[in-house]
């Protein structure tokens, strides 16, 4: 039994770090493998993660990590019974994938302006709370070509756009994702999408 693709890990910088790897053949990850992880810190204990299958030869492990701080470094040992298959390390702050934003809401009652709001996925005392920026994706259910991305580079989790920038009388969907430049994170997953019917008063034409 060998590791074909070494584990790569990302952290949500709050509770879960996810490590994925591939074996050289079909593997029952949960019965055959264990991923041990330990904070590099005096007297810290080793924790065991039981991996799950992720495709035929793929495995994924969700590591519980609380109180992550930027200096934290973990050793990782992948075991098959008594055999050490791989040894590595992981610094959560250098491999961050933020949590997805939540509670995306479209407010359509603000005089021909669409107000999109969502929730920051971190509590105020988490370092990422004040460092997230967002991308909002809006698309038409009727027209696949009507697909746009708005970059929200300020901290407030909201976006205002004129309803008239979208077509009237049709349904749109929106979703949002986050990233943090300070940690050079990857993008989060998209939030669940929300749907609304876009309608606004066309201005009278002047002749």
């Amino acid at each position: 039994m060998k590791v074909l693709q070494e584990p790569t890990c990302v952290s949500d910088y709050m509770s879960i770090s996810t490590c994925e790897w591939k074996m050289n053949g079909p593997t029952n990850c949960s019965t055959e493998l264990r991923l041990l992880y330990q904070l590099v810190f005096l007297l810290s204990e080793a924790h065991t993660c039981i991996p799950e299958n992720n495709g035929g030869a793929g495995c994924v492990c969700h590591l519980l990590m609380d109180d992550v701080v930027s200096a934290d470094n973990y050793t990782l040992d992948l075991w098959a019974g008594q055999q050490l298959l791989w040894k590595g390390s992981f610094k959560p702050s250098e491999h961050v994938k933020p949590r997805a934003p939540g509670n995306l809401t479209v407010h359509t009652n603000v005089s021909d302006t669409l107000l999109l709001t969502w929730s920051n996925p971190y509590p105020p005392d988490n370092y990422l709370y004040n460092h997230l920026t967002y991308a909002v994706n809006i698309w038409s259910e009727n027209d696949p070509a009507d697909f746009r991305i708005y970059n929200v580079t300020y901290l407030e989790p909201s976006l205002r756009i004129a309803a008239s920038t979208l077509k009237s009388g049709i349904s749109y969907r929106a979703r949002v994702r986050a990233w943090a430049q300070c940690y050079n994170t990857t993008w989060s997953e998209w939030s669940p999408s929300t749907k609304w019917h876009n309608s606004y008063r066309e201005p009278f034409e002047q002749h």
Epitope: S15, F41, E52, N103
Partner: antibody, heavy 119, light 107 residues
């Protein structure tokens, strides 16, 4: 082996005070966040409070039902967790569990609990 | 606050059965869901964290699944020690909240 032993429960009158203690052993106490969770007689589990580790400035969080009445603290040198409960109400009657936290709310080891009766 | 609902408060099953316990959240919790077992003597254990990850030392007959607002815990091939009360808990947002519990009883 992780062990969490709660003490300090007992019978107290409404508006009275009580201090619960939790002695932790078998793990690196100072790098873990800790919680108290309670269970009223015949009811489900209710999260009460949480304290983070020194690396996160011992930040504390409380359920709205106990905010401004309960105070959570820890002594890393003694591997002890404390819950000071003031202005107790009859609805605080419950079994109180000391719980280790391994990931912002994933509570992996629980003590046996200590009973608080407000009557 | 996020409300967690376990619609079935009690469930009867026989040894060797496969049972599924359901839990729903009042909003999307992005898989930040745990399952706990409480024995009649009050002992509480973490079984599953982050929807489907088996906690160390928990038998593989326990499994978890779900996404969005709907989650479930499945116990296959019930053993005598599995008759207990099971709670789901979200750790997406503070305050962390538990479902009301599902008591698994012997038929």
């Amino acid at each position: 082996e992780v062990q969490l032993v709660e003490t300090g429960g007992g019978l107290v009158q409404p508006k009275g005070s009580l201090k619960l203690s939790c002695a932790a052993s078998g793990f690196t106490f100072n790098t873990n966040a800790m919680n108290w969770v309670r269970q009223a007689p015949g009811k489900g589990l209710e999260w009460v409070a949480r304290i983070r580790s020194k690396s996160n400035n011992y930040a504390t969080y409380y359920a709205d039902s106990v905010k401004d009445r309960f105070t959570l603290s820890r002594d890393d040198s003694q591997s002890m967790l404390y819950l000071q409960m003031n202005n107790l109400k009859t609805e605080d009657t419950a079994m109180y569990y000391c719980v280790r936290d391994r990931g912002w709310g994933a509570m992996d080891y629980w003590g046996q609990g200590t009973t608080v009766t407000v009557s | 606050d996020i409300q967690m609902t376990q619609t079935t408060s009690s469930l009867s099953a026989s040894l060797g059965d496969r049972v599924t316990i359901s839990c729903s959240a009042s909003q999307d919790i992005n898989n930040y869901l745990n399952w706990y077992q409480q024995k009649p003597d009050g002992t509480v254990k973490l079984l599953i964290y982050y929807t489907s990850s088996l906690h160390s030392g928990v038998p593989s007959r326990f499994s978890g699944s779900g996404s969005g607002t709907d989650y479930s815990l499945t116990i296959s091939n019930l053993e005598p020690e599995d008759f207990a009360t099971y709670y789901c808990q979200q750790f997406s947002n503070l305050p962390w909240t538990f479902g009301g519990g599902t008591k698994l009883e012997i038929k």
